[in-house]
Structure formats: structure tokens, C-alpha cells
């Protein structure tokens, strides 16, 4: 299709080489089509647009994204060619940063139902640059945490080094929806609830003598509880002896509960004590079996192909540790009688 009639928007993504970060493009269809199509309207539910020249479907995923190759080749369907780019409804998610993401991205409705719809498209020219060392050293992170029940704030990473006074007007989105009341480089939250968690996008306009473009940053916000003050506790094994049959295979499971920590480096491992010798056992990887806001339960198994006489004199020790401290639980195998 002819993209010359598409509205054009220029965006800049300056990414930090020190951290993982994501980026999004919204299918900013011209008003009022956008409101009908992607449900990102600025209108209140009682206000109805006077005319809807674009009669697209209400299905939120009925948008098609393309990339325009720089060499003039035909448009490429994003879904087929770019595994690190994911389409979610009217949003395009870039999972990994890199200058190779620079280029022109076009979105338009899948269903063309009227002659007006042909021109219903947006071309976004995205420029991606790594942050230079000259940039602000202490810029806000692209992953920010809000402590539940307390006050907090969400800072726009690309503007966090500027004072509120010199900051340009900022447009904020949360999970793709416009936050119309927020215009500064920082969103202040009086009391943090779990619904404050989500993907926030901050946009501001930067201009030079030639052109203007939108500088965009994406912030993943987590609502968290305070760091635990407790070392992990072992939920299983509970008993310090276990009845077994010689010659049979055996799996002993160690399940431990770790309280929430912002910087979470849980350790769960098995080691064997034989007399006063001890060594760590190479066992299958640990797996998380339950995760809540407050804690996480992690499991790791030790597998014996067959229980030998030697195993009966050994102690099998599960060791768990977080930043507060460690806990151990040892199991002695006992031969089943009869």
C-alpha cells in the first residue's frame, strides 16, 4: 500500500548500555480514528466524535505493523522478521535495545472497510542511540520500585537530571493509556497501591532549527513490600530422618521460603556430609514453585539413582541463604525394616 499519505512522527530512543530496557511504539492513528480503534481516547465516555471516517473493527489487535527497509525494498511484516519485537494490541514492544532498531515503522488497520481507511496509517521514524558518557550519570532507572503503602514517585529516565522548573512538558502513559493530568518529569504517588504497577511511558518534545521529535523512555514499575528482615526458612524436609529402601532410586526435595528482597540472590543447594568430609552435590537446577508479593518458594531436589549402604551413614544437608542469613536442614537415611 502507498505510505505517502501516512501521518509521520519522529521518535528518539536513547538507551543505557548499562541496563536492560524496553521500548514501545503506539499506533497513534489520527484522531478520531484512534479513539474508535485502539481505545486510547482522550474523550470521556459521554463524548462521541462527530464523524468516524475510519470504520475499523473494535478488535484491539486489528493493527498491522510493518518496517520499511532502508534500501527501498517492500514493507516487511514485523511479526515474521523480528523476534525481539512483539506486537501487543496497538503497541509494538522492543525487548532489547540497540541501534539496529532504528528505522521506519508503519502501523495501519488490518481491515480496510472504506476508501477513507487507506490513508489511516502512521509512519514512525525511530532513531536509537546509546547514551553518551556525557549524559547524566545518575539518570533514573528503567526499572523503578514503589513501596506499597508509602509515598513514592516515578521519574522519567530521560529527564531525571533536570529540575522540575527547567523540565519540558511531559506526556505520560500507563499500560498504553494516556495519563492526562500528569505533565511533569515526575509522577508523585501519595499512597502506593498494587495497581500502580505497570509499564509507564514518558514522552517530551525536543526541537532544533530543522525539526522536532519525541524523546521517549519506558519505565517498568513494580510495587513491592519492604525487604525481609528474616533469613529463609525450610518448609521441606521437616523430619531429620527418612525411611528408604536399599537399591531403590530416591528423590529428596528441599523447599524453602524466601522473603521479598529488592536485590534477590537466593541460594539453595544440597551438600553431603560423610564423617567430617562434606561436598556440594551437582543436582538439578532450583525452580520457583510459588511467587507472591511478599515471598517466593523455591525447590531443589537431590536425586540418588539407587540408595546404597554408604548413603545410610551420610547426612544429606539442604542449605538455603539470602542476604540476611542461612538455614540448613539435614536428613539421615534409615533402612526400611520389613
Amino acid at each position: 500500500f502507498n505510505i505517502s499519505g501516512c501521518s509521520t512522527k519522529k521518535l528518539l530512543w536513547t538507551y543505557s548500555t548499562r541496563s536492560e530496557e524496553e521500548f514501545v511504539l503506539f499506533c497513534d492513528l489520527p484522531e478520531p480514528q484512534k479513539s474508535h480503534f485502539c481505545h486510547r481516547n482522550r474523550l470521556s465516555p459521554k463524548q462521541v466524535p462527530e464523524h468516524l471516517p475510519f470504520m475499523g473493527s473494535n478488535d484491539l489487535s486489528d493493527v498491522q505493523w510493518y518496517q520499511q527497509p532502508s534500501n527501498g525494498d517492500p514493507l516487511e511484516d514485523i511479526r515474521k522478521s523480528y523476534p525481539h519485537i512483539i506486537q501487543d494490541k496497538c503497541t509494538l514492544h522492543f525487548l532489547t535495545p540497540g541501534v539496529n532498531n532504528s528505522g521506519s515503522y508503519i502501523c495501519r488497520p488490518k481491515m480496510i472497510k472504506s476508501p477513507y481507511d487507506v490513508a489511516c496509517c502512521v509512519k514512525m521514524i525511530l532513531e536509537v542511540k546509546p547514551q553518551t558518557n556525557a549524559s547524566c550519570e545518575y539518570s533514573a532507572s528503567h526499572k523503578q520500585d514503589l513501596l506499597l503503602g508509602s509515598t513514592g514517585s516515578i521519574s522519567c529516565p530521560s529527564l531525571s537530571c533536570q529540575s522540575d522548573a527547567q523540565s519540558p512538558a511531559v506526556t505520560w502513559y500507563k499500560n498504553g493509556k494516556l495519563l492526562s493530568v500528569e505533565r511533569s518529569n515526575r509522577i508523585v504517588v501519595d499512597e502506593v497501591y498494587d495497581y500502580h504497577q505497570g509499564t509507564y511511558v514518558c514522552d517530551y518534545t525536543q526541537s532544533d532549527t530543522v525539526s522536532s521529535w519525541t524523546v521517549r523512555a519506558v519505565v517498568q514499575v513494580r510495587t513491592i513490600v519492604g525487604d525481609t528482615k528474616l533469613k529463609p526458612d525450610i518448609l521441606d524436609p521437616v523430619e531429620d530422618t527418612l525411611e528408604v529402601e536399599l537399591g531403590k532410586p530416591l528423590t529428596i526435595s528441599c523447599k524453602a521460603r524466601f522473603g521479598f528482597e529488592r536485590v534477590f540472590n537466593p541460594v539453595i543447594k544440597w551438600y553431603i556430609k560423610d564423617s567430617d568430609l562434606e561436598w556440594e552435590v551437582s543436582v538439578p537446577e532450583a525452580k520457583s514453585i510459588k511467587s507472591t508479593l511478599k515471598d517466593e518458594i523455591i525447590e531443589r531436589n537431590i536425586i540418588l539413582e539407587k540408595v546404597t549402604q554408604r548413603d545410610l551413614r551420610r547426612k544429606f544437608v539442604c542449605f538455603v541463604q539470602n542476604s540476611i542469613g542461612n538455614t540448613t536442614q539435614s536428613v539421615q537415611l534409615k533402612e526400611k525394616r520389613g
Partner: antibody, heavy 120, light 108 residues
């Protein structure tokens, strides 16, 4: 591999320190480093072992306590200090790694031995 | 201290025959028992560990058995290369350790 050194001709009542150097591995808590000796034409005699981990617990044959001292000099060397030597201590002294490897399999390694002769 | 008593001190066997060596500990050593083979001029070689487990690379004609205080090494289908001196050892170092006096195996 293990290599013993320090074997020598020593006078009765003299002292001597033997050194065992490990190459290809460093000490860990899954095994012991031991000393065993064998007098010419005789059987094997266990002297002492030291836990190769941080505990450094040392165990001695009853007859060796007081005269012989086993210690870890570094993460790859263990020594045996012997005092009040007599002709009966004349033997080839072997350094032995005994215990388990990192996978819990038994691991037993002997050095070639070093000869200690006690004579006036 | 643990004392290990090994019998016999010498045994001769024909090629293809069977040799049995016994070892008695002065107290329960919880199967912390090793058997070694030693040939003249060489350090000993581990044959059996934990009373009954065959060490890596050791032929299956060597078999260890026993528990508590009584242990046995059996060599079935004796070969010329089996001529050597065999030692049992308590390797329960934390409880004290000791070698047996040795058994010389002569193959005819």
C-alpha cells in the same frame, strides 16, 4: 598429582619436615590429605590425616601423637613435621589424598614416596 | 585406637582359582573400609572402597563384602598379574584409622 619432598638422612633424636605438593587441584572439604609410611620390607602404617577443608581437623595414629605434626602450609601443600626420630622411623613416607571428588565419587591418590633414613 | 587384624599373612593360589582375605576391626568401622593392592617398588593402588564398591578401572574379579567389624576381599579367577601384597585399611579417620598387616598373594 602429588609429590613428596624433604626425605633425607637424619641422626637419631633429630627432626625433619616433609612436604607434599599437590598439582592439578587445590584443597577442599571433600577429602583428607594423609601421610602413610612403609619401612623397608614391611607393611603400610598410617600416620596422620588433615581435613583439606577450612576445618583443618587433624587425626593421628596413637603412636604418632606428640612426635609428628601434620599441617596445611597452603592450599596445595601439606607438611609432616617429625621430631625425636629413631631408627624405627626409617621408611618411605607417602603423601595420600583420600576422600571424594567434587561429584562425590571416591578419589584416592598416592605420591611416589620420599625416603627418610634415621642413622648415626 | 582401631586395630585391624588381617588374615592370612600369605596365601598361594593357582591361576583361575579363588583367594579370600579377611580383615577384622577392633570396633565397628561403619563400612569405612578400603582394600589396596601393592606391587614391589610402587605405591598402593585402591581396589575397593566403602567395603564393597569397586574403584574405577578395577576388574570385577575383585569383590569386597562385610560390615561392622568383619570384612572380606575375594579374588575370583586369579590371574598372574594378581600376585601382590593386599592391605585392608579402616578409613574412618575421625574415629582413628589403621592398616591391616598385609596378605601376600602368590600365584602359581
Amino acid at each position: 598429582s602429588l609429590e613428596e619432598s624433604g626425605g633425607d638422612l637424619v641422626k637419631p633424636e633429630g627432626s625433619l619436615t616433609l612436604t607434599c605438593t599437590a598439582s592439578g587441584f587445590s584443597f577442599s572439604s571433600s577429602y583428607y590429605m594423609c601421610w602413610v609410611r612403609q619401612a623397608p620390607g614391611k607393611g603400610l602404617e598410617w600416620i596422620a590425616c588433615i581435613h583439606a577443608g577450612s576445618s583443618g581437623a587433624a587425626y593421628y595414629a596413637t603412636w604418632a601423637k606428640g612426635r609428628f605434626t601434620i599441617s596445611k602450609a597452603s592450599s596445595t601443600t601439606v607438611t609432616l613435621h617429625m621430631t625425636s626420630l629413631t631408627a624405627a622411623d626409617t621408611a618411605t613416607y607417602f603423601c595420600v589424598r583420600d576422600g571424594y571428588d567434587d561429584y562425590g565419587d571416591p578419589f584416592n591418590l598416592w605420591g611416589p614416596g620420599t625416603l627418610v633414613t634415621v642413622s648415626s | 585406637a582401631i586395630k585391624m587384624t588381617q588374615t592370612p599373612s600369605s596365601v598361594s593360589a593357582a591361576v583361575g582359582g579363588t583367594v579370600t582375605i579377611n580383615c577384622r576391626a577392633s570396633e565397628d568401622i561403619k563400612s569405612y573400609l578400603a582394600w589396596y593392592q601393592q606391587k614391589p617398588g610402587q605405591p598402593p593402588k585402591l581396589l575397593i572402597y566403602d567395603a564393597s564398591d569397586l574403584a574405577s578401572g578395577v576388574p570385577s574379579r575383585f569383590k569386597g563384602s562385610g560390615s561392622g567389624t568383619e570384612y572380606t576381599l575375594t579374588i575370583s579367577g586369579v590371574q598372574c598379574d594378581d600376585a601382590a601384597t593386599y592391605y585392608c585399611q579402616s578409613v574412618w579417620y575421625a574415629g582413628g584409622a589403621a592398616f591391616g598387616g598385609g596378605t601376600e598373594v602368590v600365584v602359581q
